[in-house]
């Protein structure tokens, strides 16, 4: 496929605001199963000084706890360093700030390396529109369709959103 291609303009600030987690994927299924360390859900994001700040919802003891994390900028524009359950190289794979965001992380915990991907959208009613893009990115990085978990309302801590 060939054609004209323009890279998106604008900075990280456009990612600020509310987001909803739609799907997770990993080559280590335990990480994204219920109670898995990466079974976490985005609530909102903001950007400052080139770093990404995220409020995430973590299911705990039947409730959802809101936790703030910061992904720190690196020399590469779409790569961030995140300390969460070990060290993560976090990459923004695909972004439409008004619609959806696909990220993936290379997680290093002790001597174990894992791959985790996350699809989030602005508008939950359009989540089906962006699942094919997520599946394509997952395939490209080596995650199969059967390693993708599409979340339900019950999964994603909807009741904990203000």
């Amino acid at each position: 496929q060939e054609g004209n291609h323009e890279e998106p303009q604008g900075g990280l600030e456009e990612l600020s605001g509310r987001w909803h987690s739609v799907a997770l994927a990993s080559n280590k299924s335990d990480l994204i199963k219920p109670w898995g360390h990466f079974r976490v859900f985005i609530h909102s994001m903001s950007a400052k000084d080139g770093n990404l700040h995220g409020d995430i919802l973590i299911p705990q003891d039947g409730q959802c706890e809101k936790v703030s994390l910061t992904a720190f900028k690196t020399a590469t524009s779409n790569k961030f360093d995140l300390e969460y359950w070990g060290h993560n190289d976090l990459y923004l794979a695909e972004v439409d700030p008004k619609s959806y965001l696909i990220l993936y992380m290379i997680n290093q915990y002790n001597d174990d390396t894992s791959l985790v991907a996350h699809l989030m959208v602005r508008d939950l009613s359009r989540q089906q529109d962006f699942l094919p893009a997520f599946e394509s990115v997952c395939e490209d990085i080596g995650l199969h369709k059967d390693q993708i978990v599409v979340l339900s309302d019950d999964d994603r801590c909807q009741g904990s959103r203000d």
Epitope: E7, N78, D89, E94
Partner: nanobody
């Protein structure tokens, strides 16, 4: 226009090695991951390898793990696939691919034939 051009394929004996290249143009190469796929005669296209935009991490299909190595030179806008200990079942057309903000871009492929 975005362009991906593979090269380096050819005929090689079992146990031999080849290094494929994929030259990219028309986009900011260093910002994007790259993937390798292959399609054997009469079979579906299958994913082979992936390398992050920085080149710091890779992932491989089980069938090639330990034999194939992906690398990239962002100064040259080129991604490589070093293939060692080649087997007849590695015979296929090899494609590089990237995904640029919602669109898939493929090269035209380079043929690798492993035969004695």
């Amino acid at each position: 226009a975005v362009q991906l051009v593979e090269s380096g394929g050819g005929l090689v004996q079992p146990g031999g090695s080849l290094r494929l290249s994929c030259a990219a143009s028309g986009f900011t190469f260093s910002n994007y991951y790259m993937s390798w796929y292959r399609q054997a005669p009469g079979k579906e296209r299958e994913w082979v390898a992936f390398i992050t935009s920085t080149g710091s991490s890779t992932n491989y299909a089980n069938s090639v793990k330990g034999r194939f190595t992906a690398s990239r030179d962002n100064a040259k806008n080129t991604v490589y696939l070093q293939m060692n200990s080649l087997k007849p079942e590695d015979t296929a057309v090899y494609y590089c691919k990237t995904r640029l903000w919602g669109n898939d871009y493929w090269g035209k492929g380079t043929l690798v034939t492993v035969s004695s």
